[in-house]
C-alpha cells in the first residue's frame, strides 16, 4: 500500500494559489504525486508525476468552490486521493499593501498600493476584486507601546500636527468591512519628523 | 442564455486601424467585468483587455498597451475594441467575454460567457 500524502493545505496569498503537502514515509523509494481539480464534473490533471510537494492552481477561477485533490505513486500502485475544498475569494489571504511615505515638516504623507494578484494584468490589484476594500493604518511613536488606528477614506492619508524631530512608525493592512475580513500588515516604515511649520506670531 | 456577438473583424495593414464590437444579442451587456482575448493561430488563449462597471477602470495587456484601446457604450450596449498601430503578430481571433461576478480580469477562468470569435488579420 502506498500511503496518502500527508497534511494537504491550500496557501493561498493574494490568488496565487499553492497547494501544498508532505510527503509520507515510504520504505521502497521515492514517491510522486498527481494533483488534480474538479472540472465540470471530471478531475482535469493539474500536475503529474511531479516529485515536487505543491501544485500551482492559481489559474483557478477567483468563485465558486473547487475540489482539488492529490495522490501518492510508486511504479504502478498509488494512495487514495486526498481532497480539499477550497473556494479562492474567500478562503485566499490578503497580503500586505504596499506604502510610500514621505515626511513635509511635522507630517506624514502617506499612499498605499493595493496588492498585485498572480495571473492579472498589472492594473487589476486586490481593490479590484474587492468593492468594500479599504485600508487600515496604525501608526505609534517609535519606542512606544501606544497604538492609533486610523481607517482612510481614499488611497492616501497625512498624519498631521505629529511631534518635531520625533520618530514615527505606520504599517497598513487591507481590510473588507462587508466580510469583516483583515489582511497582512505591511512591515512597518519609520520616519522622523522635521520642524513644526508654524510660524511664530 | 447570454449571446455575445462581437464584429469588426477584418483584414489590414501593419500600422492600420479596426474597431472591434461586442453586442449581447437581446440582452443587456450588463455585466461586472467585459473583456477581450484572443488565441493567435498554434496558440492558446491571451487575455487583451478588460473593463470594469463599477469603477469604468480599464485594464491592458503589456503587447497592447498604447496600442489598444477599451471602452463602453451603455447606450448602445456594446463594447469596442479600438486597435491601433497594428502589427503582424495581433494577428489572432478575438473573443469577447462577460464575467458574472468580476472578480478577475486576465484569466479566461474568471469569465463565463463567450462570444464566438472575429479574425483580424494584420498583413501587407
Known amino acids: 500500500m502506498v500511503p496518502p500524502p500527508e497534511n494537504v493545505r491550500m496557501n493561498s496569498v493574494n490568488f496565487k494559489n499553492i497547494l501544498q503537502w508532505e510527503s509520507p514515509a515510504f520504505a521502497k523509494g521515492n514517491l510522486t504525486f498527481t494533483a488534480q481539480y474538479l472540472s465540470y464534473r471530471i478531475f482535469q490533471d493539474k500536475c503529474m508525476n511531479t516529485t515536487l510537494t505543491e501544485c500551482d492552481f492559481s489559474s483557478l477561477s477567483k468563485y465558486g468552490d473547487h475540489t482539488l485533490r492529490v495522490r501518492a505513486e510508486f511504479a504502478d500502485e498509488h494512495s487514495d486521493w486526498v481532497n480539499i475544498t477550497f473556494c479562492p475569494v474567500d478562503d485566499t489571504i490578503i497580503g500586505p499593501p504596499g506604502m510610500q511615505v514621505e515626511v513635509l515638516a511635522d507630517s506624514l504623507h502617506m499612499r498605499f498600493l493595493a496588492p498585485k494578484i498572480e495571473n492579472e494584468y498589472e492594473t487589476w490589484t486586490m481593490k479590484n476584486v474587492y468593492n468594500s476594500w479599504t485600508y487600515n493604518v496604525q501608526y505609534w511613536k517609535n519606542g512606544t507601546d501606544e497604538k492609533f488606528q486610523i481607517t482612510p477614506q481614499y488611497d492616501f492619508e497625512v498624519l498631521r500636527n505629529l511631534e518635531p524631530w520625533t520618530t514615527y512608525c505606520v504599517q497598513v493592512r487591507g481590510f473588507l468591512p462587508d466580510r469583516n475580513k483583515a489582511g497582512e500588515w505591511s512591515e512597518p516604515v519609520c520616519e522622523q519628523t522635521t520642524h513644526d511649520e508654524t510660524v511664530p506670531s | 442564455e447570454v449571446q455575445l456577438v462581437e464584429s469588426g473583424g477584418g483584414l489590414v495593414q501593419p500600422g492600420g486601424s479596426l474597431r472591434l464590437s461586442c453586442a449581447a444579442s437581446?440582452?443587456?451587456?450588463?455585466?461586472?467585468?467585459i473583456g477581450w482575448f484572443r488565441q493567435a493561430p498554434g496558440k492558446g488563449l491571451e487575455g487583451v483587455s478588460c473593463i470594469s462597471a463599477s469603477d469604468g477602470s480599464t485594464h491592458y495587456a503589456d503587447s497592447v498597451k498604447g496600442r489598444f484601446t477599451i471602452s463602453r457604450d451603455n447606450s448602445k450596449n456594446t463594447v469596442y475594441l479600438q486597435m491601433n498601430s497594428l502589427r503582424a503578430e495581433d494577428t489572432a481571433v478575438y473573443y469577447c467575454?462577460?464575467?458574472?461576478?468580476?472578480?478577475?480580469?486576465?484569466?479566461?477562468?474568471?469569465?463565463?460567457?463567450w462570444g464566438q470569435g472575429t479574425q483580424v488579420t494584420v498583413s501587407s
Open positions: 437581446g440582452n443587456s451587456l450588463d455585466y461586472p467585468t
Open positions: 467575454a462577460a464575467s458574472l461576478y468580476g472578480l478577475g480580469c486576465k484569466s479566461e477562468a474568471d469569465y463565463d460567457y
